[in-house]
Structures are given as structure tokens and as C-alpha cells.
């Protein structure tokens, strides 16, 4: 790898550094599908953006392999809790890879936010934040799931979101 | 953009890379003003530092435009709550920009932490963490607000803090 | 610092940039020792990795000085709460340095998760996330502690973890 090659690599690196992959996707009215699929996200409006990553049906799609800090927050809330709701909410980031048929758990939280809202008319709020570094190959996807998604509260994209950046 | 220009840019980039903007500000006795303004922070003592960002009246001030991962944690706690179980805490990161007269919500959490007190012992603790990537222009500011700030507990700068770094 | 020197530094920087220090360690059955020591972590299997950082007895060990975003999440849960347990859980990231005999608190959270279980037989879940930027010197170590660790729930490395990357 001679000087010219090194130079090219440096130029390349500078350019790629300028677009260090990053994204921040925000919650929207269409985020909760009720279909059992992952949450869907706004990618362009307001605070949302994609830089060096792409998006497909709820998933952040990796274009450049590497280590990424991925994160998600969901705003939970309700008036009482839905009848028959298991007292646990699971919020997770999951990887989809062409090399494996099922989603792989990456980062997961379980919470019991309804515990103190024992009456049907009691308003409560809670929040779940996840973040961590994972290795992602080009073409792999990351999605957010919440079970039970009925308890996710969406408003303006600031309370529930999903993002990543290469570290 | 010839070789010389590229070289200059690379040298420049190396130098700027050495000071990739980052900051971590910590809670202090003076953080809670009770004035309705944002929380104030320690910028120099202990774990607090500023590198390529500046500070003014509670705000992290951006000197170099770009995408930043911004974060804040607040330690919540109390003996009982002013509004009982109905007490809601809103913890948020907000942007101030010269181009717009009002603060813009960036990342927000709502919690109902007061249900964490058991029936006899009224003492409770909770914590709220926010983090996400946002684009910030030079001169723009980010602040932290907590409503009701009476429920924020400060001690030694490790439990409530505010920071950012360019990604 | 002539052109040759600059070139060497750039080459060096590119190489070090390729291995920007990062790590993500995951919870395992052996994490909870009950000995009063820090939590122990998986460093190789599954999602766990070390890149430019090393590991020793629960600690991430810094090999390259700089500012690091360090983070940890612990999954808490139980059936009721252990008899006599103070209703507070403390989850923290602590620094060990050769220059000082005691661990230094970096980032800490306190929570009262047991208030969410309204009866002694009620199952509850909660989660605690910490993240922030700290300066670490070569040879310094960061560990995670949870008091009372009886309430940490481990399963598959996705619910309790510990990581860092240079910013």
C-alpha cells in the first residue's frame, strides 16, 4: 500500500468521515400499526433524518458495516391499564439479517409501569430508554418493537424515537 | 480542490478531530433556580468539562455545526409528592435558536414516579434518561428543563447531568 | 512538525481511527457474584466484544486515554421485594484509578422499583439506564455496581449490559 494508495484511503476516509452514518427517526401517528409488526417511524419531517443509513418498513438499514450505537426511547402512558393486560411491557431493539430467518434480540427492557395505577381512572406515564453498541453488517436491519404497543403514547416525535450512529 | 487543498483539509480535519466537540455538565446546588428557567450546571469542577462547546446560563452553546448526540439524566426523588399519584414529571432537552423566538422540544420524557412510594414509607426514587441525535447549527443552544423541578435531587454531580458530543 | 511528520501522524490517526476504542459487554449467569464486588460480564460470546479496550474482573480497562461515552443498563425484577430490603436500588458506573485507593462515582441512579408491586406476591419489572461522557486515562478501569444485586435479572445478555466508546 504505497503513498498514493494511502493518500486515496485518506481522501476516502475524509469523505466517509464527513458522512459518518447517523440517523434519528421520530414517532408519528402511523407508528403503531397494531399488526404485530415493528413500530414505524418518520424519517424526514421535523427532527428526523437519515445520513448514511436507509429506512424500510420500520427498519434502519445499514449501508456501511461497522459498530453502531443504536438507541430508542418510547413514551408509555395510559388511564389505568387495558383489561387483561399482562403487567409487563417489553421494549426492544432487534436485528434482521439475511443470514438468519428470525429477528435477533439486541437490547431489551421490561417494565411494569401499571403497578401503581390500580384504579381504572388513574393516569400514569413512564418512559423506557435503550442504547448500546452492536456490530452491523451492510444490509442488516434494526427495528423497534413494543409489547403491548397499546401503551405507547405518540405526540410530536420528541417522546418516542429511534436512532443510530457509527462509533 | 487540488492535492495541496486536500492536504490542508486533512490537516485541518486532524486538528478538529483532536477536539471533536464534547461536554459533560453536572448537577450542583445552584442547578435548581425555582425561577421557571432551565436547570443550571457545573462546567469545570469534578467530572464536568467543555471541549469545543461553550456554556451560558444553563445552555450548551454550539460552536461547530453538525449532528450531536445530546443526553441528560435527572435523579428524581422525594418524600411523598405534591400532587400525589397524579404528579407528573416532564424532563426535556430543548433547543434555542436565533431564528425562532420560542424553545423547540428535542427529546422529552414524562413519568409518574410517585407511585413508587409504598403505603407507609413515603420515600421514593426514580431516574429519567434522555439521549438522541439532533442537528445543531453554530450559535444554537440546548437546555434541560424539568417540571416539577422540586422533585429533582442533586447531590454530587453523578445523579443529574447533561452532555453532548458530535457524532 | 514538517510534512513527513504530519503524514506519519495522519497515517497513525487513520489506523487508530480504524480501531476507535469501543466495547459492549453482556450480562451472564456468572455476572452476579454476591461477594460485594462489581458485576461480571461476558466479553466474547453473542453480542459482546472488546475493541481497543480490555477487560479484567468486571472492569473495562482503558488502553488509550480520552473521552469515552460509557453506559450500562440493568434489568431489575422480582416477586415482591426481599424482606428487609431498603426500597432503593443504586445502579452506578465507577472508576478505579491507580492514583487513588477508592472507587470514584461517575454516573449513578437510584430507583424504588418495589413500589410498583402492590402485594408481596406481585411480579414487577423495571430497568435502569446510565450513559455519559467521562475522561479516562490509560490503565484506568470502569466497573458497574448494583445494590441490591439480588434484584438484577439476567437472561440472555440483552437486558443487562455495559459498554463504552471513545467520542
Amino acid at each position: 500500500d504505497g503513498p498514493a494508495g494511502s493518500w486515496e484511503q485518506l481522501i476516502q476516509e475524509r469523505r466517509s468521515h464527513e458522512v459518518n452514518p447517523a440517523a434519528h427517526l421520530t414517532g408519528a401517528n402511523s407508528s403503531l400499526t397494531g399488526s404485530g409488526g415493528p413500530l414505524l417511524w418518520e424519517t424526514q419531517l421535523g427532527l428526523a433524518f437519515l445520513r448514511g443509513l436507509s429506512y424500510h418498513d420500520g427498519a434502519l438499514v445499514v449501508t456501511k458495516a461497522g459498530y453502531y450505537y443504536i438507541y430508542s426511547k418510547v413514551q408509555l402512558g395510559g388511564v389505568g391499564c387495558p383489561l387483561g393486560l399482562a403487567s409487563t411491557i417489553t421494549h426492544g431493539l432487534y436485528k434482521r439479517t439475511p443470514r438468519y430467518p428470525e429477528e435477533l434480540e439486541l437490547l431489551v427492557s421490561q417494565q411494569s409501569p401499571c403497578g401503581r395505577a390500580t384504579s381504572s381512572s388513574r393516569v400514569w406515564w413512564d418512559s423506557s430508554f435503550l442504547g448500546g453498541v452492536v456490530h452491523l453488517e451492510a444490509g442488516e436491519e434494526v427495528v423497534v418493537r413494543v409489547l403491548d404497543e397499546r401503551l405507547v403514547r405518540l405526540r410530536d416525535g420528541t417522546r418516542s424515537y429511534f436512532g443510530a450512529f457509527m462509533v | 480542490d487540488g492535492p495541496a487543498g486536500s492536504w490542508e483539509q486533512l490537516i485541518q480535519e486532524r486538528r478538529s478531530h483532536e477536539v471533536n466537540p464534547a461536554a459533560h455538565l453536572t448537577g450542583a446546588n445552584s442547578s435548581l433556580t425555582g425561577s421557571g428557567g432551565p436547570l443550571l450546571w457545573e462546567t469545570q469542577l469534578g467530572l464536568a468539562f467543555l471541549r469545543g462547546l461553550s456554556y451560558h446560563d444553563g445552555a450548551l452553546v454550539v460552536t461547530k455545526a453538525g449532528y450531536y448526540y445530546i443526553y441528560s439524566k435527572v435523579q428524581l426523588g422525594g418524600v411523598g409528592c405534591p400532587l400525589g399519584l397524579a404528579s407528573t414529571i416532564t424532563h426535556g432537552l430543548y433547543k434555542r435558536t436565533p431564528r425562532y423566538p420560542e424553545e423547540l422540544e428535542l427529546l422529552v420524557s414524562q413519568q409518574s414516579p410517585c407511585g413508587r412510594a409504598t403505603s407507609s414509607s413515603r420515600v421514593w426514587w426514580d431516574s429519567s434518561f434522555l439521549g438522541g441525535v439532533v442537528h445543531l447549527e453554530a450559535g444554537e443552544e440546548v437546555v434541560v428543563r424539568v417540571l416539577d423541578e422540586r422533585l429533582v435531587r442533586l447531590r454530587d454531580g453523578t445523579r443529574s447531568y447533561f452532555g453532548a458530543f458530535m457524532v | 512538525d514538517g510534512p513527513a511528520g504530519s503524514w506519519e501522524q495522519l497515517i497513525q490517526e487513520r489506523r487508530s481511527h480504524e480501531v476507535n476504542p469501543a466495547a459492549h459487554l453482556t450480562g451472564a449467569n456468572s455476572s452476579l457474584t454476591g461477594s460485594g464486588g462489581p458485576l461480571l460480564w461476558e466479553t466474547q460470546l453473542g453480542l459482546a466484544f472488546l475493541r481497543g479496550l480490555s477487560y479484567h474482573d468486571g472492569a473495562l480497562v482503558v488502553t488509550k486515554a480520552g473521552y469515552y461515552y460509557i453506559y450500562s443498563k440493568v434489568q431489575l425484577g422480582g416477586v415482591g421485594c426481599p424482606l428487609g430490603l431498603a426500597s432503593t436500588i443504586t445502579h452506578g458506573l465507577y472508576k478505579r484509578t491507580p492514583r487513588y485507593p477508592e472507587e470514584l462515582e461517575l454516573l449513578v441512579s437510584q430507583q424504588s422499583p418495589c413500589g410498583r408491586a402492590t402485594s408481596s406476591s406481585r411480579v414487577w419489572w423495571d430497568s435502569s439506564f446510565l450513559g455519559g461522557v467521562v475522561h479516562l486515562e490509560a490503565g484506568e478501569e470502569v466497573v458497574v455496581r448494583v445494590l441490591d444485586e439480588r434484584l438484577v435479572r439476567l437472561r440472555d445478555g440483552t437486558r443487562s449490559y455495559f459498554g463504552a466508546f471513545m467520542v
Epitope: - | 405534591p82 400532587l83 397524579a86 413515603r122 422540586r150 447531590r155 | -
Partner: antibody, heavy 119, light 111 residues
């Protein structure tokens, strides 16, 4: 200015119930807890419980549980304390006390309502 | 419940003198560096009046001759120079745990 005005004195027979009112003015009613405290002749002060006007949530001293009920009428900024199954030892002056800004003290008090239980 | 014990039961003091009232709690009333202890004054036929909250904070409108100190289980109310209007019964009260409990009171009378 903050004012808490309580209803007038009551004389009740053992086994009866009494309902004392406390009307608040001069502040945002739902922003402050209301406590109830009594003072029996020759005794000290005794906390009965509290109500959160914003929600109607109540916390009672276990000693009075099952006999005391607090209610709130937000339209008139009034809280009520009803004590049932009265006995002679319930003879006391009953006070409402507003929770302070930091809510764990009582910064304004009503003038008191004397309840006498006698056969 | 937390038992509050005040001493002395009666304190005889001359006007202008210093009065020191003591209150002991059966367990700590501290939380995160704050003491959940309040002091009230009550005169015959009147409602109690808040003097000191959180062990040492002077309530608005209360004269500066009143001060509070202490932490954990032992607390003190001091009246630096007694005025004629200060002769009354003083109660300490804890608010860290339900039920809130008061001491039995200290009567400050003219010597």
C-alpha cells in the same frame, strides 16, 4: 391572601357521624394537599390524613381507617372530612391544614371546628 | 409509627432570655440530606402556626429569633430572645413517614 374557613361547631351523640368542611381561597386550590389534624382536650396534635384536591386521592392514618372519609368539591374549592361511629374520645378541635410548597409541612390552617361527642 | 418525644414538657423562661426546646424521633427522619422535621407554635384558642420546616428553614413571616437545627433523630428549636408573644405551646412534627406524628408539646411559660 390564603384563607381556610371551616364550618361551625357540632355536637353529636355517640355512634353518629359528623361532616366538617374547609373552604379554601387565595391560592390555586388543586396545587396543594389538604391535611386534617385534631387536638383533643389535654392532648397533643394528631394527624388524621390528607387529600389531594387535584385527584381526590386520600391517605388516612391507620388509626382512623374505616371511620374517616375525605372528599373534595373542586367547583367550590372545598374539602370535607366525615368521621363516623363517633365516640366520646373523638371530642376535639378539628383543623384543616394546607400542604406547603414543599408539601411536607402545613403552612396555613383553618380556624378549627370543635366537635363535641356527648350522650 | 415514628414516636416523637419533646423535652422539657414545660419550660419557664424570662422575657429576653434564650429558650432551647428539644425533640427526639424514634428513628431517623432524614432523606437525601434533608430532615423531614417541622416546628409549630400554638396559642390557646388558635390554630397552630408553622415556624420551621425541614428542620432549619424559617417559614416566611416568622421572626428571625426563631431557628431550628439538628438531623437524624435529634432536633432543636431555639428562640434567641423570648418576646411576650412567644409564650405558647410548641410542637415538633415528622413528615417522612405515614402517619405524620407530633411530639406531645413543650409549653413555654413566663418565669
Amino acid at each position: 391572601q390564603v384563607q381556610l374557613v371551616q364550618s361551625g361547631a357540632e355536637v353529636k351523640k355517640p355512634g353518629a357521624s359528623v361532616k366538617v368542611s374547609c373552604k379554601a381561597s387565595g391560592y390555586t386550590f388543586i396545587d396543594h394537599i389538604m391535611n386534617w389534624v385534631r387536638k383533643a382536650p389535654g392532648q397533643g396534635l394528631e394527624w388524621i390524613g390528607r387529600i389531594y384536591p387535584v385527584s381526590g386521592e386520600t391517605n388516612y392514618n391507620q388509626k382512623f381507617m374505616g371511620r374517616v372519609t375525605f372528599t373534595v368539591d373542586r367547583s367550590t374549592s372545598t374539602v370535607y372530612m366525615e368521621l363516623s361511629s363517633l365516640r366520646s374520645e373523638d371530642t376535639a378541635v378539628y383543623y384543616c391544614g394546607r400542604g406547603s410548597y414543599y408539601w411536607n409541612a402545613m403552612d396555613y390552617w383553618g380556624q378549627g371546628t370543635l366537635v363535641t361527642v356527648s350522650s | 409509627e415514628i414516636v416523637m418525644t419533646q423535652s422539657p414538657a414545660t419550660l419557664s423562661v424570662s422575657p429576653g432570655e434564650r429558650a432551647t426546646l428539644s425533640c427526639k424521633a424514634s428513628q431517623s427522619v432524614d432523606f437525601d440530606g434533608d430532615s423531614y422535621m417541622n416546628w409549630y407554635q400554638q396559642k390557646p384558642g388558635q390554630a397552630p402556626r408553622l415556624l420551621i420546616y425541614s428542620a432549619s428553614n424559617l417559614e416566611s413571616g416568622i421572626p428571625a429569633r426563631f431557628s431550628g437545627s439538628g438531623s437524624g433523630t435529634e432536633f432543636t428549636l431555639t428562640i434567641s430572645s423570648l418576646q411576650s408573644e412567644d409564650f405558647a405551646v410548641y410542637y415538633c412534627q415528622q413528615s417522612i413517614e405515614d402517619p405524620w406524628t407530633f411530639g406531645q408539646g413543650t409549653k413555654v411559660e413566663i418565669k
